[in-house]
């Protein structure tokens, strides 16, 4: 029952993640910028990894995509990898994920399938969370180093003089939303791992064995134990005993023909 | 290379007319601000008339009623339409524009133009 709570919990924490992964890829708001030096009205920047805004206090609202490729910074392409690697990682493995759930039947699926299925998904939620995390870090490092540092910086150049606008540079909620998101999705792969532990069949335990004295007619087979290695024919920890014997799990089952005699 | 060209600058009679452009050329990712200063013989460089993308304006009070501002988004061009001339209006009119550059929308500049000469003289 754990084991089946801790998997549908990771499967619900991963799906809110990765749906968080992606709002924040689609967002405008990675980066937002107030031009405070302008004398005109209150002008607002924000960029996103597909496209940058303008917002004006009139309510002006006017947004560009960016149309080439080659021509962006390094740092940008790198993002975006990082963050389309993270959601193609993350639909992946709730794919995964729903035919591994163990409340879900298909067919005669063993538990062994479904627990690798259930690490498979858990170590590519982990990987998508971490490639959201390290997405949007780098973002949030480039906006530290390239431009908090941004001062009015003049120099001459063919038609005239340039100069960097002093901007505030802000973090913007697309980044926030990005890490939550990847986190979410990280404990989320943690959690269905942890779940695949539970679904594993136990393959070197030695099962204990409640003897029934139930008459004379009980037949004790000797040489008849046989300790599950995982190696030999009982690797399904069947029954080894023909008589009153049963393994714990088979405790209650149905009395045998020798209860009775 | 970004540069900005003004045009439409020279000698008028006090009452006359000017129309002066400035064109915003090169790499452009998109203009925010756009605007006119001027610097007379002497003095610092002032605001005359500045506009957004959206149309909102800002004039100096010395020529508002006198000055208009205007832009075409799509040309990248400023222009500054004015009447009423004074002799006090005589300076360098310099363009100026807030952009950002194709190869990093991260990052604003401020551009100037090297200016044309305006003289209100009789």
């Known amino acids: 029952m754990a084991v089946t709570a801790c998997q549908g919990l990771g499967f619900v924490v991963s799906l809110i993640g990765i749906a968080g992964i992606i709002a924040a890829t689609c967002m405008d708001q990675w980066s937002t910028q107030d031009l405070y030096n302008n004398p005109v009205t209150a002008v607002f920047n924000y960029q996103g990894l597909w496209r940058s805004c303008v917002r004006e206090s009139s309510g002006f609202t006017e947004c560009r995509g960016y149309f080439t490729l080659l021509g962006l910074p390094a740092m940008l392409q790198a993002v975006r990898a990082l963050m389309i690697v993270g959601i193609v990682l993350g639909a992946i493995g709730l794919l995964v994920s729903i035919f591994a759930l163990k409340c879900i039947r298909i067919g005669s699926m063993e538990d062994s399938a479904k627990a690798n299925m259930t690490l498979t998904s858990g170590i590519m939620f982990i990987v998508s969370g971490l490639c959201a995390i390290a997405g949007v870090s780098v973002f949030a490092n480039m906006l530290v180093t390239n431009f908090w540092m941004s001062t009015a910086n003049m120099y001459t150049g063919m038609g005239g003089m340039v100069q960097t606008v002093q901007t505030r540079y802000t973090f913007g909620a697309a980044l926030f939303v990005g890490w939550v998101a990847g986190g979410l999705t990280l404990i989320g792969g943690v959690m269905m791992c942890i779940a695949c532990r539970g679904l594993a069949p136990e393959e070197t335990n030695y099962k204990a064995v409640s003897y029934h004295a139930s008459g004379h007619s009980v037949a004790y087979k000797p040489g008849g134990f046989k300790a599950s290695t995982g190696f030999g024919s009982n690797t399904k920890n069947k029954k080894i005993y023909d008589g009153g014997a049963r393994t714990e799990d088979e405790v209650q089952s149905y009395p045998s023909k020798h209860d009775y005699v | 290379q970004v540069q900005l060209v003004e045009s439409g600058g020279g000698l008028v009679q006090p009452g006359g007319s000017l129309r002066l452009s400035c064109a915003a050329s090169?790499?452009?990712?998109?203009?925010?601000?756009m605007g006119w200063y001027r610097q007379a013989p002497g003095k610092q460089r002032e605001l005359v008339a500045v506009?957004?993308?959206?149309?909102?304006?800002n004039y100096a009070d010395s020529v508002k009623g006198r000055f208009t501002i205007s832009r075409d988004n799509a040309k990248n061009t400023v222009y500054l339409q004015m009447n009423s001339l004074k002799p006090e209006d005589t300076a360098v009119y310099y363009c100026n524009a807030d952009l950002n550059l194709a190869s990093d929308p991260f990052k604003w500049y401020t551009y100037w133009g090297q200016g044309t000469q305006v003289t209100v003289s009789s």
């Open positions: 090169g790499s452009i990712f998109m203009i925010n601000v």
């Open positions: 506009i957004t993308r959206g149309a909102s304006t």
